[in-house]
């Protein structure tokens, strides 16, 4: 089996963690988040070729069926395997609060 | 906000559970699985428009950034939110075993 972390499409083309710089306006948060003003959003982007970072047996099945029926079954997709928490200072009904969100920033990626 | 379960693209077009009939040969399992000979594979297929079955805050972020930078950031993707277990009768070095797999069949779907 091919190494699950070696991208056959060339460096950086397969499913991996990317960082996208975004303002509160970009994120659609300007009306409820006070800080930070900008966020380095980590997200999972890239192709999922056969055997590359397969999350589980379901991902293997999906790839095999995609090769058989590409019009019916899509290829596996690059999504977060886990997340990093982030704190936001946000507006609330009563004022301002500091709140932790556990599902904001991707920590690592796999193909599902 | 739009109902997170109402598909704006028309019935059946958005992220949902589909069943795909597959043989052991289709799945690439013929050399190690004895039974069942055929599987009704449940998997997540469909589009992920804005606010549809968003799994978490990360999915919201991804959609907002996709609208801003469609060439850089892909839209959220339809993946399993949970799985149903399945038992397989499989060949082993010593003979035959009955094995449960927890990550084979999608149970329900969301957009990440």
């Amino acid at each position: 089996a091919r190494n699950g972390d070696r991208c056959p499409l060339g460096p950086g083309r397969c499913c991996r963690l990317h960082t996208v710089h975004a303002s509160l306006e970009d994120l659609g948060w300007a009306d409820w988040v006070l800080s930070p003003r900008e966020v380095q959003v980590t997200m999972c982007i890239g192709a999922c070729p056969s055997q590359f970072r397969e999350a589980n047996m379901h991902a293997q099945i999906k790839m095999n069926l995609h090769r058989l029926k590409p019009d019916t079954v899509p290829a596996p997709c690059c999504v977060p395997a886990s997340y990093n928490p982030m704190v936001l200072i946000q507006k609330t009904d009563t004022g301002v609060s500091l709140q932790t969100y556990d599902d904001l920033l991707a920590k690592d990626c796999h193909c599902v | 906000a739009r109902n997170g379960d109402r598909c704006p693209l028309g019935p059946g077009r958005c992220c949902r559970l589909h069943t795909v009939h597959a043989s052991l040969e289709d799945l690439g399992w013929a050399d190690w699985v004895l039974s069942p000979r055929e599987v009704q594979v449940t998997m997540c297929i469909g589009a992920c428009p804005s606010q549809f079955r968003e799994a978490n805050m990360h999915a919201q972020i991804k959609m907002n950034l996709h609208r801003l930078k469609p060439d850089t950031v892909p839209a959220p993707c339809c993946v399993p939110a949970s799985y149903n277990p399945m038992v397989l009768i499989q060949k082993t070095d010593t003979g035959v075993s009955l094995q449960t797999y927890d990550d084979l069949l999608a149970k329900d779907c969301h957009c990440v």
């Epitope: 006070l34 800080s35 900008e38 380095q40 704190v87 200072i89 507006k91 609060s97 932790t100 | -």
Partner: antibody, heavy 121, light 107 residues
Framework: QVQLVQSGAEVKKPGASVKVSCKAS????????ISWVRQAPGQGLEWMGW????????FYAQKLQGRVTMTTDTSTSTAYMELRSLRSDDTAVYYC??????????????WGQGTLVTVSS | DIQMTQSPSSVSASVGDRVTITCRAS??????LAWYQQKPGKAPKLLIY???SLQSGVPSRFSGSGSGTDFTLTISSLQPEDFATYYC?????????FGGGTKVEIK
Amino acid sequence: QVQLVQSGAEVKKPGASVKVSCKASGYTFTNEGISWVRQAPGQGLEWMGWISAYTADTFYAQKLQGRVTMTTDTSTSTAYMELRSLRSDDTAVYYCARTRHDTSGLRFDYWGQGTLVTVSS
Amino acid sequence: DIQMTQSPSSVSASVGDRVTITCRASQGIDSWLAWYQQKPGKAPKLLIYAASSLQSGVPSRFSGSGSGTDFTLTISSLQPEDFATYYCQQVHSFPITFGGGTKVEIK
């Protein structure tokens, strides 16, 4: 380089008010918040509150609610902290601190030199 | 409010010693903790943020660890300029709170 320069020492009578300024330079003032921290003689650090330099939204420590007001002047990149109805136990060194906020959370990465406020009759 | 308890309140040590200061939060704060050093008559200085990230310009003999409720600041080999008071700070929720401080003194 980032600098926070505070106004000079003050001596006030009980019941009076004091307004301490904190002039920021070396960064985009509206990109980060400002926190105010005080330290009574021989004591530890006490957080007084935070202000967004962008929106001017504030959070004040419960203990100081109704007596403290934090403001900013973006045209001069200056933050202000006013404390009213001063009491002797308000005698302290008052610090402003840039409140850096990113995906690694919050931290007070640059501090003013401190302003000694003495409340005495 | 989240209470931050530091121990010990003071420690006597010699140059070259390994010094460990602990900080306990009254409830879980993930890794949202910072450490500061303060010398007499000076403003505090940021050493560590996000429990274990070293602030730019701070010597690598300083390190932080922990998550949840229990945290540690370690000075691997105490230098003469490290004699000071150290404070932990939770930035998990408002109001932000500091520990009571640990004074590192010359033995």
